[in-house]
Amino acid sequence: QGWQAFKNDATEIIPELGEYPEPPPELENNKTMNRAENGGRPPHHPFETKDVSEYSCRELHFTRYVTDGPCRSAKPVTELVCSGQCGPARLLPNAIGRGKWWRPSGPDFRCIPDRYRAQRVQLLCPGGEAPRARKVRLVASCKCKRLTRFHNQSELKDFGTEAARPQKGRKPRPRARSAKANQAELENAY
């Protein structure tokens, strides 16, 4: 199926506070992961801050005509193309409990389609041929999803489903920590 670009603009997906749910407590290895409510120093941003736009998962809006052989849609359709980076975690505060930010390398995320929508289009054909009706599947929204070793690169795992495994080489310490980990960044960029 051919596509002809008509125009495009961009929308940045910057997650709101609380957009991602907290993991169940048992996934945190019986530890409180330095959240602000556990006391300690007031939160601040220890990590190097970059321009948010450099890391946003963007929805590029493309207006195109749908073509099928010699036939073309009577009206253009608007579709999203997912583009840009995912992170940093300062935009995803509720994910921090799962993140082991002190590691030099961590989960890799991609900006990919999240939801789709079906749209019926009417195709006009040359030579007096009767118009055809076609249903097309269009990207409706984008999301940061984690690459996972249990899937192919094309099949991605939702950001909110990452579970922390117990780590080797350390014992659970169920006591309050400083607020600093709340400010961690997952600077995963592509």
Epitope: P104, S105, G106, P107, N188
Partner: antibody, heavy 119, light 110 residues
Framework: EVQLVESGGGLVQPGRSLRLSCAAS????????LHWVRQAPGKGLEWVSG????????DYADSVKGRFTISRDNAKNSLYLQMNSLRVEDTALYYC????????????WGQGTTVTVSS | QSVLTQPPSASGTPGQRVTISCSGS????????VNWYQQLPGTAPKLLIY???QRPSGVPDRFSGSKSGTSASLAISGLQSEDEADYYC???????????FGGGTKLTVL
């Protein structure tokens, strides 16, 4: 100027202990996660251990687990590596390194201290 | 034997573009971000690329990183004599639960 300076290296017999230190300056120490990375003579880099803001955030390489202990003293701007039951294969240049960008690589390095384990 | 596989050596002439590969598996590069380090002779390593393709401030844009599947690459364009060094890739390995380095690639500028 951001600086990490390692000390405590030396010649030690197999089975003995050694404690490495890393003194930091030029940055807010407890904003950084800190790591030990070693390099055997003529060989590549090998990550040894890492610690976050406190002892609740620690990782070790399998090769040193149970023998080495990483710790930090934020009041003294210092990182430590207690090395017990040393083996000949632990002979290496030990680097102290840090990262203050979550999952963003080790962006600060010391010049290293040499540990030689030999009988 | 390193968990991440790099060619032991690479070479190029000044001005040329050179690429260094790093091959891993689904438990390291396939899942986690890749970092690259440069170690000039007799000096400590230096972070060159983090999070697959991001350059820390001060690193020239001649250096670029990319990742696809379980492999990563470091590209150096406009090769200069001062680029002669050892280059290491690294990533967290979820199976080993540790930070793993490639064996290193010695880059020679002819």
């Amino acid at each position: 100027e951001v600086q990490l300076v390692e000390s405590g290296g030396g010649l030690v017999q197999p089975g003995r202990s050694l404690r490495l230190s890393c003194a930091a300056s030029g940055f807010t120490f407890d904003d950084y996660a800190l790591h030990w990375v070693r390099q055997a003579p003529g060989k590549g880099l090998e990550w040894v251990s890492g610690i976050g803001w406190d002892d609740d955030m620690i990782d070790y390489a399998d090769s040193v687990k149970g023998r080495f202990t990483i710790s930090r003293d934020n009041a003294k701007n210092s990182l430590y590596l207690q090395m017990n039951s040393l083996r000949v294969e632990d002979t290496a240049l030990y680097y102290c390194a840090g990262n203050n960008r979550g999952y963003g690589g080790l962006d600060v390095w010391g010049q290293g201290t040499t540990v030689t384990v030999s009988s | 034997q390193s968990v991440l596989t790099q060619p032991p050596s690479a070479s190029g002439t000044p001005g040329q573009r050179v690429t260094i590969s790093c091959s891993g598996s689904s438990s390291n590069i396939g899942t986690n971000t890749v970092n690259w380090y440069q170690q000039l002779p007799g000096t400590a390593p230096k972070l060159l690329i983090y999070s697959n393709n991001q350059r820390p401030s001060g690193v020239p844009d001649r250096f670029s990183g990319s990742k696809s599947g379980t492999s990563a690459s470091l590209a150096i364009s406009g090769l200069q004599s001062e680029d002669e060094a050892d280059y290491y890739c690294a990533a967290w390995d979820d199976r080993l639960d540790e930070y793993v380095f490639g064996g290193g690639t010695k880059l020679t500028v002819l």
